[in-house]
Amino acid sequence: QDPWAAEPRAACGPSSCYALFPRRRTFLEAWRACRELGGDLATPRTPEEAQRVDSLVGAGPASRLLWIGLQRQARQCQLQRPLRGFTWTTGDQDTAFTNWAQPASGGPCPAQRCVALEASGEHRWLEGSCTLAVDGYLCQFGFEGACPALQDEAGQAGPAVYTTPFHLVSTEFEWLPFGSVAAVQCQAGRGASLLCVKQPEGGVGWSRAGPLCLGTGCSPDNGGCEHECVEEVDGHVSCRCTEGFRLAADGRSCEDPCAQAPCEQQCEPGGPQGYSCHCRLGFRPAEDDPHRCVDTDECQIAGVCQQMCVNYVGGFECYCSEGHELEADGISCSPAGAMGAQASQDLGDELLDDGEDEEDEDEAWKAFNGGWTEMPGILWMEPTQPPDFALAYRPSFPEDREPQIPYPEPTWPPPLSAPRVPYHSSVLSVTRPVVVSATHPTLPSAHQPPVIPATHPALSRDHQIPVIAANYPDLPSAYQPGILSVSHSAQPPAHQPPMISTKYPELFPAHQSPMFPDTRVAGTQTTTHLPGIPPNHAPLVTTLGAQLPPQAPDALVLRTQATQLPIIPTAQPSLTTTSRSPVSPAHQISVPAATQPAALPTLLPSQSPTNQTSPISPTHPHSKAPQIPREDGPSPKLALWLPSPAPTAAPTALGEAGLAEHSQRDDRWL
């Protein structure tokens, strides 16, 4: 059998690892697999990173292909750009390296495409169908630090065997990510187990210094110690346990606190109790009991539905407002009667969608041209008086479903993985936080919470995306965004969905970056962040009344009042990119520094009668979708009467919205 296809392998540097998984997967499946291990599909943005990928992949067969983290939505060609309109699965287009197999051709690129790397030769980048199951995929894992591989000792029975936090076992590493375990076997029959841990003086290092296979007082049987044997001054020996274990009552053996820990899902040694519990992707710790895990509300993920979303355990449903119908993908909404030729290429359309769409949206964009921000970082807003924003729902849903505007929320790291900051290569001048948006967000990596930004590379108008600020603990009030208060009026028990409130989770001690807000039940009071408002428009913040027309039993009615939110601009440095294409000279682009006030969309109706878009999701032909691969599927429909808001160019509130169409999607997003 082919050695290339045998087992996963990895190559690690001091701050990241690339791992090759020779498993046949579609792009979506590969993306999921990397995320489940705490990483992302590989994003080789610099020649140095590409060199590490090259050495990892080696000289494979010409017929083999490996997914990397580049995808492009239909009709998003930008052939003059180094990435040609492709976006990294981390949500940006920053690169100082490309390796396209062919020069850009001027085709219309009608369908969505993903990029695979050739396993042979120059490891060129090829584009193709995202639904093809290619031969394997490359993951990338970022971490806070790494330990160098252990030096072989004279008394060793063989090379150290390393196990990484992403479950790769090998003897071939040069660097070991924080959280890795090294197992050393000695000729004398005993061995040692070491953990790559944080050092008191800073940085990371092995939990025990060498030599590991020498010593007399502890010979011949390691002094009877299961882990470490220490020779005291008076000649007697005492036993110690490696990090993450504690000495048992017999004083010799070591026990894993996680073996008895009552964690429902994942346990990590350490912490005041000797262990700490974590939840798998898609779950979060229960408020009342951190040992238990509760289902993540998918509707909190920005962009999971184009218009409205209802969560339930294990899945969610998308809905469209009156005058719009749900498209076949179960996510996007288009004006009623326009299903054949999608009238809006909106958020759902831009999620991994293989569909074609000939509609032009330039008019809709021009009508809203002032409302986007070039800030790729988090937008900080001055605190303002929170306006009243009362919601009244009367949905006919099962009791465990919650109609909500989608927002992101944190997930927790897997066992032995360090709390992470977003991985960025040397092309970026600072670590940059993820942008969160109610319309076109960039999702954070599952284990990479955002950090506070400094300066950011400028993005062109093509890549502007709306931004919502997340609220962060322990920051001066000047940097806290305004909060819009949302409250629900009481409903009969049979129809009342659980109420939600946005709250900011406690950070893990010592080294946790701020997380996104999660939403939790808190009586009937809901606090939620809404999109900011363009400075030149007074937003119409909506208040929901309890009175509903008899024709619309499941309707959502909004009343309006105005509030203004000030915004702070951010400066942005430049970025240079290079290309390693065998057929064209190096791309050299220089993006000038820019300082712009951030401007955000408010709730919008359709921008033009012929090209209607979501009332709450203004669209731009080149604005970036959330980087969530997804598969399409048929969707049941629910028709409901509600009046539509009249088209207008100025931002106004959504007058009335109903759950006009919905799609049940069980675990269809990631």
């Epitope: 296809a5 067969p61 017929s63 062919q102 369908a111 495409r113 090829l126 193709g128 293989d354």
Partner: antibody
């Protein structure tokens, strides 16, 4: 130029076996997967399975599992397909086809070159 | 298994005509669709790959479009040598290829 040349026609009795060959030339044999496809009289094309000359990896259509075996002679750049326990409904033209890897910067798994076909007639 | 259904089964047209053949998949196959031309007694020839990309050497009058479940092969101006049987093929669940039943294009 790339060519796939298949062996001549075969007439077999029900229950017998047939083994046909597909000789490749004009490219590096181990770089491309070889698929086998058959077409009964007036029928649509039917995929039978593939063999990867790089590592001898094979995958067969469930319909033919247990009856079909695909092998290689790398030194002769030749792929073989054997079908056992023949029945009258196995009467068909059998094609070998090369799976493309990439065209003009695109990766794709369509079949870019085909052999001329081997007619197998199963009759008592 | 993914089924492919072509329509029509038979098509009569004249030289110079514009003809369209459609192929519908029983589930989403993205753009992993190819079109082949087969003449009597000959092996199929690749025309279009990845739903819309013309294979090297294929005349520009042949074009493909579609994604998801609905695909189209269009011949903009029929030439005498175009009368043949056309097959669509999906390979999204590679290596499990499936083919349509074929569309026979005849001279009117």
């Amino acid at each position: 130029q790339v060519q796939l040349v298949q062996s001549g026609p075969e007439v077999k009795k029900p229950g017998a076996s047939v083994k046909m060959s597909c000789k490749a030339s004009g490219y590096t044999f181990t770089d491309y997967v070889i698929h086998w496809v058959r077409q009964g009289p007036g029928q649509r094309l039917e995929w039978m399975g593939y063999i990867n000359p790089y590592d001898d990896d094979t995958t067969y259509n469930q319909k033919f599992k247990g009856r079909v075996t695909m092998t290689l002679d790398k030194s002769a750049s030749t792929a073989y397909m054997q079908l056992n326990s023949l029945r009258s409904e196995d009467t068909a033209v059998y094609y070998c086809a090369r799976r493309g890897n990439s065209y003009d910067g695109y990766f794709d798994y369509s079949m870019d070159y085909w052999g001329q076909g081997t007619l197998v007639t199963v009759s008592s | 298994d993914i089924q492919l259904t072509q329509s029509p089964n038979f098509l009569s047209a004249s030289v110079g005509d514009r003809v369209t053949i459609t192929c519908r998949a029983s589930q989403n196959v993205g753009t992993a669709v190819a079109w082949y031309q087969q003449k009597p007694g000959k092996a199929p020839k690749l025309l279009i790959y990845s739903a819309s990309n013309r294979y090297t050497g294929v005349p520009s009058r042949f074009s493909g479009s579609g994604s998801g479940t609905d695909f189209t092969l269009t011949i903009s101006s029929l030439q005498p040598e175009d009368f043949a049987t056309y097959y669509c093929q999906q390979y999204t669940n590679y290596p499990m290829y499936t083919f349509g039943q074929g569309t026979k294009l005849e001279i009117k």
